[in-house]
């Protein structure tokens, strides 16, 4: 780590559209990027009637919105698709939803992607 920063070298990978995109459904993704760029992990998901459906998880490149975030937390109020990003290996394994404007229970990730 540089100046105490958590280096991201790999992230949990998931793709709900794996069949159409011809990718693996789940796994570990190595994160690459230019030396002067920071690397992050991300997760995107939907909340459909209280059921969490993961859309994608993987690596995300140098985004100031992700700097120094050790936890993957969505803070936007009721987005159509939830997004969070973080720094640190596999930090996107767990993700949660804490809207900034109101106090609610977090929506943690209860989902283990099922194999095809």
């Amino acid at each position: 780590a540089i100046l105490g920063r958590s280096e991201t070298q790999e992230c949990l990978f998931f793709n709900a559209n794996w069949e159409r995109d011809r990718t693996n459904q789940t796994g570990v993704e190595p994160c690459y990027g230019d030396k002067d760029k920071r690397r992050h992990c991300f997760a995107t998901w939907k909340n459909i009637s209280g059921s969490i459906e993961i859309v994608k998880q993987g690596c995300w490149l140098d985004d100031i919105n992700c700097y120094d975030r050790t936890d993957c937390i969505e803070k936007k109020d009721s987005p159509e698709v939830y997004f969070c990003c973080c720094e640190g290996n596999m930090c996107n394994e767990k993700f949660s939803y804490f809207p900034e404007m109101e106090v609610t229970q977090p929506t943690s990730n209860p989902v283990t992607p099922k194999p095809p």
């Epitope: 159409r20 011809r22 690459y32 997004f83």
Partner: antibody, heavy 120, light 107 residues
Framework: EVQLLESGGGLVQPGGSLRLSCAAS????????MNWVRQAPGKGLEWVAG????????GYADSVKGRFTISRDNSKNTLYLQMNSLRAEDTAVYYC?????????????WGQGTLVTVSS | DIQMTQSPSSLSASVGDRVTITCRAS??????LNWYQQKPGKAPKLVIY???SLASGVPSRFSGSGSGTDFTLTISSLQPEDFATYYC?????????FGGGTKVEIK
């Protein structure tokens, strides 16, 4: 300095084939996804195909699926686009472009392009 | 496929003007939105990625905003070298798709 240099374009008859190449330098080629994007004369940009860092994942636009094949040779730092059954509507400048991660496909470096003309 | 709609298709502006270009996606693309600048006879150049992140070497007068379906590229004070065509592009899912472009011309 990142450089991408396309070659292989030219005039071909409808139904013919061409193979485009993109020679990469100035970065660790084997660590990046790569893409082909085309631009018909006077028109906008159209993504053609993409391939992840190790060639394990490939994606194609519907307009070229089954006719074009993207591939890469990481030992030669080269990206390829094999184009078969070419049509007049494939006439365009073809750019190779470097992507980031498979899920984070912003194209941060582009080649200068190579012109493909399909005409009888 | 996700459709990307840019507006306006062209605009005329003067040096020093504040210019805003909008891009709308046919479904939520979260923050998977990139902006490119292209000058005649040249390859496109990345300007903004992930909706708000400034690409390397791009002047700070360029900024991006938005999430979900609606996005904006703003040039705070237009410079002579900024006259070009600008494209948005989504990377939320394959196939990657581009907007139709916005041509920024000199008034």
């Amino acid at each position: 300095e990142v450089q991408l240099l396309e070659s292989g374009g030219g005039l071909v008859q409808p139904g013919g084939s061409l193979r485009l190449s993109c020679a990469a330098s100035g970065f660790t080629f084997s660590s990046y996804s790569m893409n082909w994007v085309r631009q018909a004369p006077g028109k906008g940009l159209e993504w053609v195909a993409g391939i992840n860092y190790n060639g394990g994942y490939k994606g194609y636009a519907d307009s070229v699926k089954g006719r074009f094949t993207i591939s890469r040779d990481n030992s030669k730092n080269t990206l390829y686009l094999q184009m078969n059954s070419l049509r007049a509507e494939d006439t365009a400048v073809y750019y190779c472009a470097r992507g980031a991660n498979w899920h984070d496909t912003h194209l941060d470096y582009w080649g200068q392009g190579t012109l493909v003309t399909v005409s009888s | 496929d996700i459709q990307m709609t840019q507006s306006p298709s062209s605009l005329s502006a003067s040096v020093g003007d504040r210019v805003t270009i909008t891009c709308r996606a046919s479904q939520s693309i979260v923050r998977y939105l990139n902006w490119y600048q292209q000058k005649p006879g040249k390859a496109p150049k990345l300007v903004i990625y992930a909706a708000t992140s400034l690409a390397s070497g791009v002047p700070s007068r360029f900024s991006g905003s938005g999430s979900g379906t609606d996005f904006t590229l703003t040039i705070s004070s237009l410079q002579p070298e900024d006259f070009a065509t600008y494209y948005c592009q989504q990377s939320y899912e394959l196939p990657l798709t581009f907007g139709g472009g916005t041509k920024v011309e000199i008034k």
